[in-house]
């Protein structure tokens, strides 16, 4: 059965031609019997909200390569499964790429997709606070405070999937000054733009700013975490809050360092390094699986500062939900 699934060729990561991974090889899915129930499961698995359609996979460019195989002849989901792998599947016996299945989901909002390449908040605690930097022609540039407003901050926070913008007087401290070229000033956002690059601004690279005037933005950063199902707040199944929704964390790669960061963030002392059996006594979660392949050095103050796959990307079931037991 597939170990991974993705949508390819769409305008965003929540629509496109359906591709599944088997034994390290990505291939397509035949549209025999492909319907909205199958798409609903796929959208759920990808953290993409509700299903909105079953377009033909042939609509998405670039088309499947000739060497790429159709891997699955048909998928039959009831619509309640968490992953496509849990649905009844028939191995391919005769299908061509003309019949590749496609899917489109309602919810491609930025919090469910990779952090946008075009803007970032640098040198802050997590990706939702920091110095504004914009990518242009493969180079990162800082943004001058001249003309900057809360409306512009709203656009950045929305673009990064970081919730609401917080009104802050904070300036870049000396060690967080940019060393990159200054991109532009006189940002004039209405607050409704999809990306910062859509806001009118002064001419590219033409300004009299220096790095003392680099813009700092703080967003609400809706990240939080909790341990549920235990006897106290310092033990239980780990859940993280993202975009206002609580979800579980997959145990792929999870270990002692990750435990320590969680216990530290919760003010719960040190990890008691529970056994596999002890971890399983809190049962599986329900709903979203937000994080997978979390990697911490152990020095982080927040789990959000650890490396992990993009929000909602995973190849797990709730049987793999992480549980943590701290000393309290």
């Amino acid at each position: 059965s597939p170990s991974g699934v993705r949508l390819v060729g769409g305008l965003h990561r929540c629509e496109g031609r359906v591709e599944v991974e088997q034994k390290g090889q990505w291939g397509t899915v035949c549209d025999d019997g492909w319907d909205i129930k199958d798409v609903a499961v796929l959208c759920r698995e990808l953290g993409c909200g509700a299903a909105s359609g079953t377009p033909s996979g042939i609509l998405y460019e670039p088309p499947a390569e000739k060497e790429q195989k159709v891997l699955i002849q048909s998928v039959s989901c009831t619509g309640t499964e968490d992953t496509l792998a849990q649905c009844e599947q028939e191995e391919v016996y005769d299908c061509s790429h003309d019949e590749d299945a496609g899917a489109s989901c309602e919810n491609p909002e930025s919090s469910f997709s990779p952090v946008p390449e075009g803007v970032r908040l640098a040198d802050g605690p997590g990706h939702c606070k920091g110095r504004v930097e914009v990518k242009h022609q493969n180079q990162w540039y800082t943004v001058c405070q001249t003309g900057w407003s809360l409306r512009a901050a709203k656009v950045v926070c929305r673009q990064l999937g970081c919730g609401r913008a917080v009104l802050t007087q904070k300036r870049c401290n000396k060690h967080a000054y940019g060393r990159k070229p200054i991109w532009l000033s006189q940002m004039s956002c209405s607050g409704r733009e999809a990306t910062l690059q859509d806001c009118p601004s002064g001419p590219w690279g033409k300004n009299t700013c220096n790095h003392d005037e680099d813009t700092w933005v703080e967003c609400e950063d809706p990240f939080d975490l909790r341990l549920v199902g235990g006897d106290n707040l310092c033990s239980g199944r780990l859940e993280v809050l993202h975009k206002g929704v609580w979800g579980s964390v997959c145990d792929d790669n999870w270990g002692e360092k990750e435990d320590q960061v969680v216990c530290k963030q919760l003010g719960c002392g040190k990890s008691l390094s529970p056994s596999f059996r002890d971890r399983k006594c809190y049962g599986p979660g329900v709903g979203r699986i937000w994080l997978d392949n979390v990697r911490c050095s152990g020095e982080e103050q927040s789990l959000e500062q650890c490396q992990h796959r993009f929000w909602g990307f995973h190849d797990c079931t709730h049987q793999e939900d992480v549980a943590v037991i701290c000393s309290g």
Partner: antibody, heavy 116, light 111 residues
Framework: QSVEESGGRLVMPGGSLTLTCTVS????????MGWFRQAPGKGLEWIGI?????STYYATWAKGRFTISKTSTTVDLKLTSPTTEDTATYFC?????????????WGQGTLVTISS | ELDLTQTPASVSEPVGGTVTIKCQAS??????LAWYQQKPGQPPKLLIY???TLASGVPPRFKGSGSGTEFTLTISDLECADAATYYC?????????????FGGGTEVVVK
């Protein structure tokens, strides 16, 4: 709908031969066509297929020896450097609509004899 | 390379009887198997595909079963018109490659 093979004849070993499959009532741009052969008193053997879009796929043993091509109403099978082992009745068939590897409409076949 | 082995090579049954033909694949082919009937001097006729799905116009006396490596074609209530050679065929196409192979055939004689 009809499928008819032609071009079968006596050919010397090492010569060249092209068989033609002429179709009527079949849209070759949306159907997969296959070539098969059957030596006298023997079983069926698959040679290759051509999909509606023009891509071709051959049996391992047939690669480099056979070439399939088409026009709007014909599908040709070219055999280079035949040997006596290639003596057989050659069939052209249309794949089951929507599929590529099983065939529900066959021609009567054309006999090819390779002999010196 | 896939091998399909058909047994028996020849079978003789009276009118009204039942014939069972087996086809064994050298490796797992799931349900990707078709059956054809061929009468002398005629092209093959598709009877069954996907191991058990009856082709249009084929009477339900013909029944295909099996999956993986073991497949069976059962012909019940034999008629004189059923006298022919029957072939199993592996049918597989995945957009990148085609794999089509036939068994050696089973001759059915109706007494």
């Amino acid at each position: 709908q009809s499928v008819e093979e032609s071009g079968g004849r006596l050919v010397m070993p090492g010569g060249s031969l092209t068989l033609t499959c002429t179709v009527s009532g079949i849209d070759l741009s949306s159907n997969t066509m296959g070539w098969f052969r059957q030596a006298p008193g023997k079983g069926l053997e698959w040679i290759g297929i051509m999909r509606g879009g023009g891509s071709t796929y051959y049996a391992t043993w047939a690669k480099g020896r056979f070439t399939i091509s088409k026009t709007s109403t014909t599908v040709d099978l070219k055999l280079t450097s035949p040997t006596t082992e290639d003596t057989a009745t050659y069939f052209c068939a249309r794949a089951f609509p929507g599929y590529n590897s099983f065939f529900n409409f066959w021609g009567q076949g054309t006999l090819v004899t390779i002999s010196s | 390379e896939l091998d399909l082995t058909q047994t028996p090579a020849s079978v003789s049954e009276p009118v009204g009887g039942t014939v069972t033909i087996k086809c064994q694949a050298s490796h797992n082919i799931n349900s990707a198997l078709a059956w054809y009937q061929q009468k002398p001097g005629q092209p093959p006729k598709l009877l069954i595909y996907k191991a058990s799905t009856l082709a249009s116009g084929v009477p339900p006396r013909f029944k295909g079963s099996g999956s993986g490596t073991e497949f069976t074609l059962t012909i019940s209530d034999l008629e004189c018109a059923d006298a022919a050679t029957y072939y199993c065929q592996r049918h597989y196409f995945d957009g990148a490659s085609a794999d089509i192979a036939f068994g050696g055939g089973t001759e059915v004689v109706v007494k």
